[in-house]
C-alpha cells in the first residue's frame, strides 16, 4: 500500500463572522501524481471550494506558511466568512486518470462553525 | 548513513538490454518514493523514471516510455531499472535517487554508467 | 513540458564575494503556494547534492551561505560569501509538474 497521506490536523475550527478562516492540509508525498481540491461536504453533492487548476475562487487565497521536509503544506483561508460558510471541509487527493483524475485519498475533515460577528 | 549504490551498467549494443539495480540502506526505503535520474556530457541531467513508495505508480517522460520498466522489492530494499531497445542516446552515468515527498531529490547513488554502442 | 532556462552558464566570482544563478520556468512550478523549484551541487566525479528544496530552504547539513529565492517562474541561488569549496556546477529542477525537468547548468570558479 502506498503511503501517501492527506493531514487535516484541526476537527474543528470556529470563526467569526466576516474574518477569515484557515483550513490546514498537509500531505506527505506528491505520488501519485494528480491535483488536490477542496470540498464542502461529502459525496455527490458536495460543493468545489478550490481547485488551482480551474476556476474562479475569488474568497480562497493558498497558504504555505511553514516549509516541513517531511510534507507539503496545501492549506487555504477563505475571506470574509458567513454563517452560509458553515460545514465540514474536505481536502482531497485525486490521482490523474485519463480521461478524467480519479479520486485518490481524502482527509478526515474540518469543521467549520461561525460565530456571530461581535457587537 | 544513506547509501544508494547502484549496479548492473555496461556496454550494450543497440536494440539490447540492460536492467540496472540500487540497493538501499540507511533509510526507511518503503516510505520514499524512488528515481533514476542520468547524466550526459551533452544532456546534462535528464529524469528517467519514478515509482511510488508502495510500487503501484510509476512515471516516465516520452523519451524512455514504453522501453524502460521501473519496480521496487520494499523487503529487500532494491530498486530496478529493465532497460529494453536501448539506443545510442541513452549512454549515460544512470543514478538512483530517493524523494521522502516525491518532489525533490534527496540522496543520490554514485552512479552506474551505461553504454550504448555497436 | 516546463523548459527550465538556467544563466549564465559558467560565473566566475572572486573569494569572498557573493555568486548569483538565475532560473526560469517556462510557466508557474508553484502550487498553494508550494514553489516546486529544488537547487543542487555537483563536484567533478560525485553525483548531485541537495542544496535548497521547494525554492528557498536550506537543505539539513548545507551551510547557510547559500540561499535560494523566487517563486512562479523566477528563481534565484546565491552563495555569499563564495569559498574556495563551492567550485562545481549547479543544476535547478523543477517537480511542479511531469515531465520533470532540469535547468542546463551553472560552472561557478573562482576569479
Known amino acids: 500500500e502506498d503511503e501517501l497521506q492527506v493531514i487535516q490536523p484541526e476537527k474543528s475550527v470556529s470563526v467569526a463572522a466576516g474574518e477569515s478562516a484557515t483550513l490546514r492540509c498537509a500531505m506527505t508525498s506528491l505520488i501519485p501524481v494528480g491535483p488536490i481540491m477542496w470540498f464542502r461536504g461529502a459525496g455527490a453533492g458536495r460543493e468545489l471550494i478550490y481547485n488551482q487548476k480551474e476556476g474562479h475562487f475569488p474568497r480562497v487565497t493558498t497558504v504555505s506558511e511553514l516549509t516541513k521536509r517531511n510534507n507539503l503544506d496545501f492549506s487555504i483561508s477563505i475571506s470574509n466568512i458567513t454563517p452560509a460558510d458553515a460545514g465540514t471541509y474536505y481536502c482531497v487527493k485525486f490521482r490523474k486518470g485519463s480521461p478524467d483524475d480519479v479520486e485518490f485519498k481524502s482527509g478526515a475533515g474540518t469543521e467549520l462553525s461561525v460565530r456571530a460577528k461581535p457587537s | 548513513e544513506v547509501q544508494l549504490v547502484e549496479s548492473g551498467g555496461g556496454l550494450v549494443k543497440p536494440g539490447g538490454s540492460l536492467r540496472l539495480s540500487c540497493a538501499a540502506s540507511?533509510?526507511?526505503?518503503?516510505?520514499?518514493?524512488m528515481s533514476w535520474v542520468r547524466q550526459t556530457p551533452g544532456k546534462g541531467l535528464e529524469w528517467v523514471a519514478t515509482?511510488?513508495?508502495?510500487?503501484?505508480?510509476?512515471y516516465y517522460p516520452d523519451s524512455v516510455k514504453g522501453r524502460f520498466t521501473l519496480s521496487r522489492d520494499n523487503a529487500k530494499n532494491s530498486l530496478y531499472l529493465q532497460m529494453n531497445s536501448l539506443r545510442a542516446e541513452d549512454t549515460a552515468v544512470y543514478y538512483c535517487?530517493?524523494?521522502?515527498?516525491?518532489?525533490?531529490?534527496?540522496?543520490w547513488g554514485q552512479g552506474t554508467t551505461v553504454t550504448v554502442s555497436s | 513540458d516546463i523548459v527550465i532556462t538556467q544563466s549564465p552558464a559558467s560565473l566566475a566570482v572572486s573569494l569572498g564575494e557573493r555568486a548569483t544563478i538565475s532560473c526560469r520556468a517556462s510557466?508557474?512550478?508553484?502550487?498553494?503556494?508550494?514553489?516546486?523549484m529544488h537547487w543542487y551541487q555537483q563536484k567533478p566525479g560525485q553525483p548531485p547534492k541537495l542544496l535548497i528544496y521547494r525554492a528557498s530552504n536550506l537543505e539539513s547539513g548545507v551551510p547557510d551561505r547559500f540561499s535560494g529565492s523566487g517563486s512562479r517562474t523566477d528563481f534565484t541561488l546565491t552563495i555569499n560569501p563564495l569559498q574556495a569549496e563551492d567550485v562545481a556546477t549547479y543544476y535547478c529542477?523543477?517537480?511542479?509538474?511531469?515531465?520533470?525537468?532540469f535547468g542546463g547548468g551553472t560552472k561557478v570558479e573562482i576569479k
Open positions: 529542477h523543477q517537480s511542479g509538474d511531469l515531465p520533470w525537468t
Open positions: 510557466e508557474s512550478v508553484d502550487s498553494y503556494g508550494n514553489s516546486f
Open positions: 535517487a530517493s524523494q521522502l515527498t516525491g518532489s525533490e531529490f534527496d540522496y
Open positions: 515509482i511510488s513508495s508502495g510500487g503501484t505508480y510509476t
Open positions: 540507511g533509510f526507511t526505503f518503503s516510505s520514499y518514493v
